[in-house]
């Protein structure tokens, strides 16, 4: 039961992490004009990934794309990599974790199977969870290098009578998405991680052979590496999966590795 | 089509206030700005504040004091409240209307408000 | 405050020949967003209120004859009417339309000859 909700909950974490990716990437607000200590002006600039926008006062927003690939500064190019993979890795990993969720059943796939999806797509969470991070990490950073840099020389003189406003950036909504989206997806990979624990079979992927001894029953697996005794063990009729893996509803009556996670 | 109506009282005592109603028609306030700008007789034009659709306000730094820009968008009215009148303050006020370019695209036919003993 | 100020004054001309009025701005109107010009023009003809002619530096407002031509970036700008008409008789202001508060120029006014 509780490998089933960790792993239901590692799915739903992730699933609002990825959305939550997803926002970011497509949002215009990942950089917005300082306000703080600037002249007000009637127009706010703001910028994201793939366009940038000016709202007026007047309430008339323009956005243009950035329509040239080569002229973009190449930190942005490997932003908008990672923010990609991110969402494409998490995309693939919510997919096979549907098909890897306990409470769903899909023709006779095995536990073992399932657990191994639900190990593919936790490690796939957390590569998404962590690319996301990054590349909202690396836009940060460019940020605040921008930030300081146009601090310097916030007003440039011409000929020492006119001045121009230099416009200065920093952190737009999209970055605390992008921060927070990124770590559920990752909360979420290591969620299906230890699911998948809880999922993988004791040992071996043999058909578990039963031999009722005299005395207490004693579960004997072909390879003789391990013995497990069942104290009180449940009596009633169960089918026996393939490698001894429990069913969902089973009652565990045994101490087992996988009860601590 | 967009229409804007200025109403005010035409002639103020000094040092009283003025309040003027500026009646908009063929667009809603929720969408477009409102801003004052008045011109005394035979000279140029002064901006002296802004309500936006959002309900933001702003002023002229030489008059903050003085000046409140209120609207209510239900009866698709702005009003603009001046204290301490000078015969300075003599003057057409007009409202306009915010476009694009943060520019005044209409105009009203301005009130004429002449601060006389 | 910004500072417009207008040159010249008083332009007196015949019609049809073409006129240039400049406006100057004590700061860049340039927004670095969207790479405009927050400049504005307007037509003002005695007993009216002001007419939207240009807003942007060099974007004519609809209905604007295109014999208006409003050009120049940063802080210089010039307003050009081609060929002047008898109906032009009147004051032009440019406004900053970029920072609080929004200022004009003191206006040129236009006079036919």
């Known amino acids: 039961m509780a490998v089933t909700a960790c792993q239901g909950l590692g799915f739903v974490v992730s699933l609002i992490g990825i959305a939550g990716i997803i926002a970011a990437t497509c949002m215009d607000q990942w950089s917005t004009q300082d306000l703080y200590n600037n002249p007000v002006t009637a127009v706010f600039n703001y910028q994201g990934l793939w366009r940038s926008c000016v709202r007026e006062s007047s309430g008339f927003t323009e956005c243009r794309g950035y329509f040239t690939l080569l002229g973009l500064p190449a930190m942005l190019q490997a932003v908008r990599a990672l923010m990609i993979v991110g969402i494409v890795l998490g995309a693939i990993g919510l997919l096979v974790s549907i098909f890897a969720l306990k409470c769903i059943r899909i023709g006779s796939m095995e536990d073992s199977a399932k657990a191994n999806m639900t190990l593919t797509s936790g490690i796939m969470f957390i590569v998404s969870g962590l690319c996301a991070i990054a590349g909202v990490s690396v836009f940060a950073n460019m940020l605040v290098t921008n930030f300081w840099m146009s601090t310097a020389n916030m007003y440039t003189g011409m000929g020492g009578m006119v001045q121009t406003v230099q416009t200065r950036y920093t952190f737009g909504a999209a970055l605390f998405v992008g921060w927070v989206a990124g770590g559920l997806t990752l909360i979420g990979g290591v969620m299906m991680c230890i699911a998948c624990r809880g999922l993988a079979p004791e040992e071996t992927n043999y058909k578990a052979v039963s031999y009722h001894a005299s005395g207490h029953s004693v579960a004997y697996k072909p390879g003789g590496f391990k013995a497990s005794t069942g104290f009180g063990s449940n009596t009633k009729n169960k089918k026996i999966y393939d490698g001894g893996a429990r069913t969902e509803d089973e009652v565990q009556s045994y101490p087992s590795k996988h009860d601590y996670v | 089509q967009v229409q804007l109506k200025e109403s005010g009282p035409g002639l103020v005592a000094p040092s009283q206030s003025l309040s003027i109603t500026c009646t908009v028609s063929?667009?809603?306030?929720?969408?477009?700005?409102v801003s004052w700008v008045r011109q005394p007789p035979g000279k140029g034009l002064e901006w002296l504040g802004a309500?936006?659709?959002?309900?933001?306000?702003n002023y002229n730094s030489a008059l903050m004091s003085r000046l409140s820009i209120s609207k209510d968008n239900s009866k698709s009215q702005v009003f603009l409240k001046m204290t301490s009148l000078q015969t300075d303050d003599t003057a057409i006020y007009y409202c306009?209307?915010?476009?694009?370019?943060?520019?005044?695209?209409?105009w009203g036919q301005g009130t004429l408000v002449t601060v006389s003993s | 405050d910004i500072v417009m100020t207008q040159s010249p004054s008083f332009l007196t001309v015949t019609a049809g020949e073409k006129v240039t009025m400049s406006c100057k701005s004590s700061q860049s109107l340039l927004n670095s967003g969207n790479q405009k010009n927050y400049l504005t023009w307007y037509q003002q003809k005695p007993g009216q209120p002001p007419k939207l002619l240009i807003y942007w530096a060099s974007t004519r407002d609809s209905g604007v004859p295109d014999r208006f031509t409003g050009s120049g970036s940063g802080t210089d700008f010039t307003l050009t009417i081609t060929s002047v008409q008898a109906e032009d008789l009147a004051v032009f202001y440019c406004?900053?339309?970029?920072?609080?508060?929004?200022?004009f120029g003191s206006g040129t006014k236009l006079e036919i000859k």
């Open positions: 406004q900053n339309a970029y920072f609080y508060p929004f200022t």
């Open positions: 309500i936006w659709a959002g309900g933001n306000r």
């Open positions: 306009a209307r915010g476009s694009y370019g943060s520019s005044f695209a209409n």
């Open positions: 063929g667009f809603s306030l929720t969408s477009f700005g």
